[in-house]
């Protein structure tokens, strides 16, 4: 997150970290059910661990943390590497979470976002770009949903209805390492960090997010079929 600020503790209990061993964070994810996460399809790895209820980036033990294995990862069948359409994936955890103030699911919005909607994006991704500098704790950033026309103007021939753009003033953006993390609008999950320009936070080059309102049926049916 570029030019965000430290999230208040306990305010993002659905935020998950996807880790490669030993404790290398490579993507964010979102708890949407007691045993299921959503993340970006481009975050798929065969071997990874899931950390929930953790505030700092470092692997230091926190009393609220819960660790999991992913037993199943189900990318959206319409995703195409290295493209950006349908960039979402469900991960089934090896057990159900223990609900606490630090670990709790969020509902996926069935309403598509309208321009001007205020949202919050969070993650442990780099706080500088093109340099790489990772934060000590979870970062939060207020962003506004842009119209689809502004989005298409920013990225000609690259935007479809499975994506939406959001941003703020130049210099504020999600970035590498935030992928798969949540965009929360009006208390529900509206999007996932998907892609954007490099370096991040360039003028007139907003972040692009997976438009989850288009996938509520797929999410529900996939969870039901695999529970």
């Amino acid at each position: 997150i570029i030019n965000g600020s430290d999230c208040d503790m306990h305010t993002q209990p659905w935020q998950a970290a996807l880790l490669l061993r030993p404790n290398q964070l490579y993507c964010g994810a979102v708890l949407v059910h007691p045993q299921w996460l959503l993340t970006a399809a481009h975050c798929r790895k065969k071997v990874f661990r899931v950390r929930l209820g953790h505030y700092s980036l470092s692997p230091v033990y926190e009393s609220g943390q819960q660790m999991f294995q992913g037993v199943k990862s189900i990318p959206h069948p319409g995703y195409s590497h290295p493209g950006h359409s349908n960039d979402l994936m469900l991960i089934k955890l090896n057990r159900r979470i223990r609900p606490t103030k630090d670990v709790r699911p969020i509902n996926v919005s069935s309403h598509c976002p309208s321009a001007g909607t205020k949202c919050l994006v969070s993650g442990w991704g780099t706080t500088k770009s093109p340099q790489v500098h990772f934060p000590k704790v979870l970062q939060c950033l207020n962003i506004s949903v842009l119209s689809q026309k502004r989005c298409e103007d920013a990225y000609p021939r690259q935007i479809d209805d499975t994506m939406f753009c959001a941003g703020d003033k130049a210099g504020r953006d999600s970035c590498q390492g935030d992928s798969g993390g949540p965009v929360v609008c009006n208390g529900s999950l509206q999007g996932l960090v998907s892609w954007g320009d490099y370096p991040c936070a360039r003028p007139n080059r907003p972040g692009v997010y997976t438009n989850l309102c288009k996938f509520t049926k797929w999410i529900q049916e996939t969870i039901q079929a695999n529970s």
Epitope: R21, Q69, P75, P77, Y79
Partner: antibody, heavy 117, light 110 residues
Framework: EVQLQESGPGLVKPSGTLSLTCAVS????????MSWVRQPPGKGLEWIGD???????DYASWAKGRVTISQDKSKTQVSLKLSSVTAADTAVYYC???????????WGQGTLVTVSS | AYDMTQSPSSLSASVGDRVTITCQAS??????LAWYQQKPGKAPKLLIY???TLASGVPSRFSGSGSGTDFTLTISSLQPEDFATYYC????????????FGGGTKVEIK
């Protein structure tokens, strides 16, 4: 050097159990999923199953109930057991490492197991 | 079931030819497809993963494309060392799968 080496009896009697081990060197089993694949003489590759560092195991549907895959991370080896074997199980058996992006990037040299009385 | 069908099962070609092998999945596997080369008496060798990403040390004459159900392996200019059997493998799911590999395509000298 990253290496995989399969070993086990080259001959197994029908209705017996085929037991193979795969010795792993040059990388930690805690970081990678491992696969077993076999190839009957003159035929194509057949996936048998995968084992993950967490000891989660996926088996091919034909192998469920007959195959057991396990690992000993301290001894850095992966094992395969196939019970109730018939002549149709005669094959070269390979172990392989997944590169974490769903490609098998390191393979053992393979070991031929013949099922015959 | 996610069955993988390769075609052709064999082909004859000359050195310098452009060769195309196809792999079709019975359901969408997104981009989780790998290609392997196998020579007689040897273990398979990974060529391409994620449908189009070249594995380390693989010559650039090999390329992969496709997503969903239809995938292609192309050898832009066939070399003598490329005569071998090629296999595709899906990595989309392991649930209720008989085999993750396609049946293979043997590339022979014309």
């Amino acid at each position: 050097e990253v290496q995989l080496q399969e070993s086990g009896p080259g001959l197994v009697k029908p209705s017996g159990t085929l037991s193979l081990t795969c010795a792993v060197s040059g990388f930690p089993l805690s970081n990678y999923a491992m696969s077993w694949v076999r190839q009957p003489p003159g035929k194509g590759l057949e996936w048998i199953g995968d084992i993950y560092p967490s000891d989660i195991i996926d088996y091919a549907s034909w192998a469920k109930g007959r195959v057991t895959i396990s690992q000993d991370k301290s001894k850095t080896q992966v094992s395969l057991k196939l019970s109730s074997v018939t002549a149709a199980d005669t094959a070269v058996y390979y172990c392989a490492r997944d590169n974490n992006d769903y490609g098998l990037d390191i393979w053992g040299q393979g070991t031929l197991v013949t099922v015959s009385s | 079931a996610y069955d993988m069908t390769q075609s052709p099962s064999s082909l004859s070609a000359s050195v310098g030819d452009r060769v195309t092998i196809t792999c079709q999945a019975s359901q969408s596997i997104s981009s989780w497809l790998a290609w392997y080369q196998q020579k007689p008496g040897k273990a398979p060798k990974l060529l391409i993963y994620l449908a189009s990403t070249l594995a380390s040390g693989v010559p650039s004459r090999f390329s992969g494309s496709g997503s969903g159900t239809d995938f292609t392996l192309t050898i832009s200019s066939l070399q003598p060392e490329d005569f071998a059997t090629y296999y595709c493998q899906q990595g989309y799911t392991n649930s209720n799968i008989i085999n993750t590999f396609g049946g293979g395509t043997k590339v022979e000298i014309k």
